[in-house]
């Protein structure tokens, strides 16, 4: 049917656009941007996610945020919206837009997202200098239905608040040196 054919061609166009971007082909980013702009659907939103990741990798954070906001407008799928909003909040924290990040996180509903939202909320609050708020967010996250790894990480962040947190970089270096 026409519907099946158009879905198949949209899927193929999406695959082509995203594969070209991930392989770093010349002119692939403008082509993917065009695809995302023209496809106001799940494929467009997924293309925006991939593009945003490329922009983050190139440290073009403003572009990444704009692309993610475009992706949000393109889909009605709640889970996909949650993933996009999480990425957006991370980028906003990096852009020192903590209040915007907190607003973004407030839009993510559903028990399944509670722990990862709590982790990011803590990071956003800490970036504003609100240590007590960060502690409360992480404590709530630890109590939620959370994977052991994420729970442990948030507990470590709580502990670090009281001992003058070593930088995330140093934590990562320590981890890698013992791998």
């Amino acid at each position: 049917s026409h519907q099946v054919d158009s879905a198949r061609s949209a899927s193929l166009a999406y695959q082509n656009a995203v594969t070209a971007v991930s392989e770093g082909k010349p002119d692939s980013i403008p082509a993917a941007e065009k695809f995302a702009a023209e496809n106001k659907n799940t494929y467009g939103a997924l293309a925006s996610l991939e593009l945003a990741q490329q922009f983050v990798d190139k440290n073009e954070l403003e572009k990444a945020a704009a692309q993610l906001q475009q992706g949000l407008a393109d889909t009605s799928d709640e889970n996909l919206k949650a993933v996009i909003n999480l990425r957006l909040a991370r980028v906003q924290v990096q852009l020192k837009q903590a209040d915007a990040a907190l607003k973004t996180l407030d839009t993510i509903k559903g028990e399944g997202w509670a722990a990862i939202v709590a982790d990011l909320r803590g990071e956003a609050l800490l970036s504003k200098g609100d240590k007590q708020g960060a502690r409360s967010a992480w404590e709530a996250g630890v109590k939620s239905d959370v994977t052991p790894a994420l729970s442990e990480m948030m507990q470590m962040k709580i502990n670090n608040l009281s001992i003058g947190s070593p930088s995330r970089l140093e934590e990562e270096l320590r981890r890698r040196l013992t791998e």
Partner: nanobody, 122 residues
Framework: EVQLQESGGGLVQPGGSLRLSCTAS???????????MGWYRQAPGEERVMVAA???????MYRESVQGRFTVTRDFTNKMVSLQMDNLKPEDTAVYYC?????????????WGQGTQVTVSS
């Protein structure tokens, strides 16, 4: 985009010393100074592992197996990192890679040099 150029590998006898150096380009001093700089190594048939690093705060950190034998130093003003390797052992034989680690909040980003061969053999 950070580019890394190593120098100083070679062949050395067990118990000997070597010094590796690495200079970064394509990045401002202030941007690089917010990143960690250090060294990884990859022995034949093994995974690449971090050996030593200097954080953005200037703290030197080491893998346990090289502690006391290797010294990592970082020159923040000249975008350089060096690895002084003393009392070398045959198991230190590997390709050594200069490495920069950037914290991008939602992920860590790695930059690598081309690698320089260190062979410890009598």
């Amino acid at each position: 985009e950070v580019q890394l150029q190593e120098s100083g590998g070679g062949l050395v006898q067990p118990g000997g010393s070597l010094r590796l150096s690495c200079t970064a380009s394509g990045v401002t001093i202030s941007a690089l100074n917010a990143m960690a700089m250090g060294w990884y190594r990859q022995a034949p048939g093994e995974e690449r592992v971090m050996v030593a690093a200097v954080s953005s705060r200037g703290n030197a950190m080491y893998r346990e197996s090289v502690q006391g034998r290797f010294t990592v130093t970082r020159d923040f003003t000249n975008k350089m990192v060096s690895l002084q390797m003393d009392n070398l052992k045959p198991e230190d034989t590997a390709v050594y890679y200069c490495h920069v680690l950037e914290d991008r909040v939602d992920s860590f980003h790695d930059y690598w040099g081309q690698g320089t061969q260190v062979t410890v053999s009598s």
